[in-house]
C-alpha cells in the first residue's frame, strides 16, 4: 500500500559538510513502528546511506558508525547527514515504511537535492 512522503526539493550543506532536512509522511493508519531509510541517487545508481527503525515515543537511533542522525515528532522525521563532501552532492531520497501494526505501508519521497561545496583552503600566510 502506497503512502505519500514529502521532503524539500533542495538543501545546501553547511561549510562543515552537514545537511538537514525534514521527511514527512502521511500515515494512513496508526503507525507505531516506522523504518526510515535514506537513499542516494547519483548517475542512475541508488545506494543506501543509512536506515533506522523506531517505535513511536522512542528515540530514532541509527547504527553507531552511521553518518546520519535524526529525531522524530509525530509523522515527521528530522534527518541530519554529516561528513559530506562535494563528491557527495546528489539526490537524497527518503523512504518510509510503516512496519507495525499491519498493514504494511511504503512511501518514497521525490528526493532532496543536496549540494555540497568543499570549503576553500585557507590561503598561506607568510
Amino acid at each position: 500500500k502506497a503512502m505519500h512522503v514529502a521532503q524539500p526539493a533542495v538543501v545546501l550543506a553547511s561549510s562543515r559538510g552537514i545537511a538537514s532536512f525534514v521527511c514527512e509522511y502521511a500515515s494512513p493508519g496508526k503507525a507505531t513502528e516506522v523504518r526510515v531509510t535514506v537513499l542516494r541517487q547519483a548517475d542512475s545508481q541508488v545506494t543506501e546511506v543509512c536506515a533506522a527503525t523506531y517505535m513511536m515515543g522512542n528515540e530514532l537511533t541509527f547504527l553507531d558508525d552511521s553518518i546520519c542522525t535524526g529525531t522524530s515528532s509525530g509523522n515527521q522525521v528530522n534527518l541530519t547527514i554529516q561528513g559530506l563532501r562535494a563528491m557527495d552532492t546528489g539526490l537524497y531520497i527518503c523512504k518510509v515504511e510503516l512496519m507495525y501494526p499491519p498493514p504494511y505501508y511504503l512511501g518514497i519521497g521525490n528526493g532532496t537535492q543536496i549540494y555540497v561545496i568543499d570549503p576553500e583552503p585557507c590561503p598561506d600566510s607568510d
Epitope: 507505531t32 513502528e33 517505535m55 513511536m56 515515543g57 512496519m99 507495525y100 499491519p102 498493514p103 504494511y104
Partner: antibody
Framework: QVQLVQSGAEVVKPGASVKISCKAS????????INWVKQNPGQGLEWIGD????????NSNQKFEGRATLTVDTSISTAYMELSRLRSDDTAVYYC?????????????WGQGTLVTVSS | DIVMTQSPLSLPVTPGEPASISCRSS???????????LYWYLQKPGQSPQLLIY???NLASGVPDRFSSSGSGTDFTLKISRVEAEDVGVYYC?????????FGGGTKLEIK
Amino acid sequence: QVQLVQSGAEVVKPGASVKISCKASGYKFTDHFINWVKQNPGQGLEWIGDINPNNGGTNSNQKFEGRATLTVDTSISTAYMELSRLRSDDTAVYYCARLRREYFYAMDYWGQGTLVTVSS
Amino acid sequence: DIVMTQSPLSLPVTPGEPASISCRSSKSLLHSNGITYLYWYLQKPGQSPQLLIYQMSNLASGVPDRFSSSGSGTDFTLKISRVEAEDVGVYYCAQNLELPLTFGGGTKLEIK
C-alpha cells in the same frame, strides 16, 4: 534470559473486572510491543490487542474494544490488561507475549498464562 | 477479519514418520513487498505457545530443521520430516497481514 511472568489465577463474579499483570525481564522493556491473547478452555487463540510500552499507544481487536484496557508501568517493566464487565464466556487463559521485529512482529516469548474463571 | 482454517483437526503419527498440516487463509497473505505474513506456533501440552516459523518459511531460533513450511498466498503446509515424541501438541497457523491478528483453530498432533 527473556522472561514474561504473569500474575496468578483469578476467580471473579460476572459484571466485575479483573486486572492481570505481565512482568518482563531479560531485555529492554521499551524495545518491544506486548500483545495479549485469549485462549478459551480447550480451544484456539484469539488476539486481544497490543501496547507500545514507550507511549502507551494501543491497537485492539474490536471484539474486546471498550472492555479490555491495556496499560504499562515502565518503571517496573510490567504490562497490564484489565477486562471489565466480565461474562461467563470470558472464562479463559490469558497470555501476554512479546513481539520481535527480527521475526517480522511474531510473538517470540510468551508468559505462562493466567486463568480467569468467571463464576457466580 | 481474515479467517484461518486448518486441517486436519487431529493428526495421529507414528514416530519417525512424516507429518503434514494444512492452513488456508480467506485472503492472500502475500504482500506486494514480497513478504508472506504467515506464522506457525506450537503449544505443547500444559505449556504456552511457542513460535516455530515466521514469514511463511523461516525457522525461529532453536527450532529443529525437521520442520519446514511452504505455500502460496492462501494455502500453506507445515511439514515435519520425521516426527519425534517431543513434537506432540497443538499447531496453530496465524496471520499478521492485517489487524486483528487471527489464528487457525489448531491441529492436534499425537503419537500413535
